[in-house]
Interface confidence: low
């Protein structure tokens, strides 16, 4: 349904508060270096303009597209050329090329200082002095650091952020109340950002067919009692929502997400018995709840899949008649029966089934050719099962920090060309799979672990795309979305890599080590470990363990010394010399 004024339509649908929040997020995700005040000014101008269009949809410029209106506004920023360089060239383009140009310049790793958390009293004062500005600042700071953050979900995080301050700034012990809540929001926010980044990568790099396949599998696991057509409708709507958000169309995205939540709550009976408690909540919470809802119980009487997909003589007829629908139904039927499989495994099985039909339906005896297709699935299923089993055993044996270190060594040997900060970030996150998934019952381990690893490896892929250094990484990232994790798992020591020259500066430490938090100390040590492996890629586990144990002992000794800096100056070179000898 067309509207005379798109901006008036969205303003009326979303309401002023959400409209302003979403425009701020959109602008902050595009112009990540602009100061907060500049963005607030732009948002206020757009909001005032939207109000004139609500009053009179025929007013001047009200008929312009949102991309035109927002792009024109972004292009009024005076310092565009100085701050963003070639991004300023986007402003010479017409829509839709201009918006595509802005999208291409989104930076997944912007050069922004880490957010420092002020004292609790300082934060509470700022919250009470100007709550609106305080919350806008939160949206701005998160959005500019996470340019693909799912915008309507960020509004939900902001609402929780507001609630935490409203509650805790009244509490007797403000810090005890507030800090755990902020930690939880930070960790959940990072996870949410990374999950959305995979959705956007899936849509942008592999197309909406890949995203739809992912969504069919995931929604079929969540809603196994729903009909295929119901799942297909949800997939179509969800694809539209995420395509819009990933494309920077945040107002449309939020509006359509609200419509989807409304539809799901009005049609619970044909979707899932688990939606009830979500549907009583207010909009932002409801949408979040629906996205995170647990899997419904599987229908008790599901027949064997073999009848329709292997034994039937009509398989090739059915496949030829409507390939995507037939494969979609196969994926739906398989996924609803297997909540214990990862989505990526289900997609690999569907891919294998498709490849078999492509080959067999052209054969002299198709039925004979595809009769054993389900047997071919066994190795595909066993591979992630074994991987999860082995890595959970290793995690339980080592604990999280040492498990991360094992992964750091493993991945540095596979792709030593990748930058050290990226290897540390990615390996630390890969290592978090242990605490997240290994404690779960067997039936939930694989979906938890492999689908989490896909999210983390996507982060490696988007960072690597910005500065490509390894053909192996490029190959694993671009050849097949569903086979990314197996591709990385299969990589061995890079024999072609020329070891990095030893640089004593890399292994020179100072007394500031002693004032770091436990996490920051770990990152420092893990950075040194990566550099060691880059210097000696063929070092054994035992050699590396010896060096790292010595390192820990050396840091502990100097942090206990009276003159810490003198200790680091004296003991540091000894540690470096001993390490070189140990690795020779």
């Amino acid at each position: 349904d067309t509207h005379k004024s798109e901006v008036a339509h969205r303003f009326k649908d979303l309401g002023e508060e959400h409209f302003k929040g979403l425009v701020l997020v959109a602008f902050s995700q595009y112009l990540q270096q602009c100061p907060f005040e500049e963005h607030v000014k732009l948002v206020n101008e757009v909001t005032e303009f939207a109000k004139t269009c609500v009053a009179d949809e025929s007013a001047e410029n009200c008929d312009k597209s949102l991309h035109t209106l927002f792009g024109d506004k972004l292009c009024t920023v005076a310092t565009l050329r100085e701050t963003y360089g070639e991004m300023a060239d986007c402003c010479a383009k017409q829509e839709p090329e201009r918006n595509e140009c802005f999208l291409q310049h989104k930076d997944d790793n912007p050069n922004l200082p880490p957010l420092v958390r002020p004292e609790v009293d300082v934060m509470c004062t700022a919250f009470h002095d100007n709550e609106a500005t305080f919350l806008k600042k939160y949206l701005y700071e998160v959005a500019r650091r996470h340019p693909y953050f799912y915008a309507p979900e960020l509004l939900f995080f902001a609402a929780r952020y507001k609630a935490a301050f409203a509650e805790c700034c009244q509490a007797a012990d403000k810090a005890a109340c507030l800090l755990p809540k902020l930690d939880e929001l930070r960790d959940e926010g990072k996870a949410s950002s990374a999950k959305q980044r995979l959705k956007c990568a899936s849509l942008q790099k592999f197309g909406d067919r890949a995203f739809k396949a992912w969504a069919v599998a995931r929604l079929s696991q969540k809603f196994p009692k729903a009909e295929f057509a119901e799942v297909s409708k949800l997939v179509t709507d969800l694809t539209k929502v995420h395509t819009e958000c990933c494309h920077g169309d945040l107002l449309e995205c939020a509006d359509d997400r609200a419509d989807l939540a409304k539809y799901m709550c009005e049609n619970q009976d044909s979707i899932s018995s688990k939606l009830k408690e979500c549907c009583d909540k207010p909009l932002l919470e409801k949408s979040h709840c629906l996205a995170e809802v647990e899997n419904d119980e599987m229908p008790a009487d599901l027949p064997s899949l073999a009848a329709d997909y292997v034994e039937s003589k009509d398989v090739c007829k059915n496949y030829a008649e409507a390939k995507d629908v037939f494969l979609g139904m196969f994926l739906y039927e398989y996924a609803r029966r297997h909540p214990d499989y990862s989505v990526m495994l289900l997609l690999r099985l569907a891919k294998a089934y498709e490849a078999t039909l492509e080959k067999c339906c052209a054969a002299a005896d198709p039925h004979e050719c595809y009769a054993k297709v389900f047997d071919e699935f066994q190795p595909l299923v066993e591979e992630p099962q074994n991987l999860v089993k082995q890595n959970c055993e290793l995690f339980e044996q080592l604990g999280e920090y040492k498990f991360q270190n094992a992964l750091l060594v493993r991945y540095t040997k596979k792709v030593p060309q990748v930058s050290t900060p990226t290897l540390v970030e990615v390996s630390r996150n890969l290592g978090k799979v242990g605490a997240k998934c290994c404690k779960l019952p067997e039936a939930k381990r694989m979906p938890c672990a492999e689908d989490y690893l896909s999210v983390v490896l996507n982060r490696l892929c988007v960072l690597h795309e910005k500065t490509p250094v390894s053909e192996k990484v490029t190959k694993c990232c671009t050849e097949s979305l569903v086979n990314r994790r197996p591709c990385f798992s299969a990589l061995e020591l890079d024999e072609a890599y020329v070891p990095k020259a030893f640089n004593a500066e890399t292994f020179t430490f100072h007394a500031d080590m002693c004032t770091l938090s436990e996490k920051e100390k770990q990152v420092k040590k893990q950075t040194a470990l990566v550099e060691l492996v880059k210097h000696k890629p063929k070092a054994t586990k035992e050699q590396l363990k010896g060096v790292m144990d010595n390192f820990a002992a050396f840091v502990e000794k100097c942090c206990k010394a009276d003159d810490k800096e003198a200790c680091f100056a004296e003991e540091g070179p000894k540690f470096v010399a001993a390490s070189q000898a140990a690795l020779a």
Epitope: E227, A229, N267, A322, V325
Partner: nanobody, 117 residues
Framework: QVQLVESGGGLVQPGGSLRLSCAAS????????MSWVRQAPAKGPERVSA????????IYADSVKGRFTISRDNAKNTLYLQMNSLKPEDTAVYYC??????????PGQGTQVTVSS
């Protein structure tokens, strides 16, 4: 909510004709292949005919070839089955389904076709 409502069935003499309709709602009809499936008493479901999403491809069971014609009107979200030269063995409940499955998709009750003199 997905809905498929079949109509047009009835009692007809051998050699007679019927036109079945299936009104679809709650999903993007034009994106899916559709099928007619029938189930006779004490028998399993049999796919009678299927049609691709744009109507360009059709498939018929050997038992109905040359007698039945499947068609669709995407503008009206409706699927049709024209049945000519009906035989007693065509007696069954006829369902429309989404895609090429023989499992009824949605809460359609089907429409009873009885061929008898």
């Amino acid at each position: 909510q997905v809905q498929l409502v079949e109509s047009g069935g009835g009692l007809v003499q051998p050699g007679g004709s019927l036109r079945l309709s299936c009104a679809a709602s709650g999903f993007t009809f034009g994106q899916f292949g559709m099928s007619w499936v029938r189930q006779a008493p004490a028998k399993g479901p049999e796919r009678v005919s299927a049609i691709s999403s744009d109507g360009s491809g059709t498939i018929y069971a050997d038992s109905v070839k040359g007698r039945f014609t499947i068609s669709r009107d995407n503008a009206k979200n409706t699927l049709y089955l024209q049945m000519n030269s009906l035989k007693p063995e065509d007696t069954a409940v006829y369902y429309c389904t989404i895609g090429s499955s023989t499992t009824p998709s949605g809460p359609g009750q089907g429409t009873q076709v009885t061929v008898s003199s």
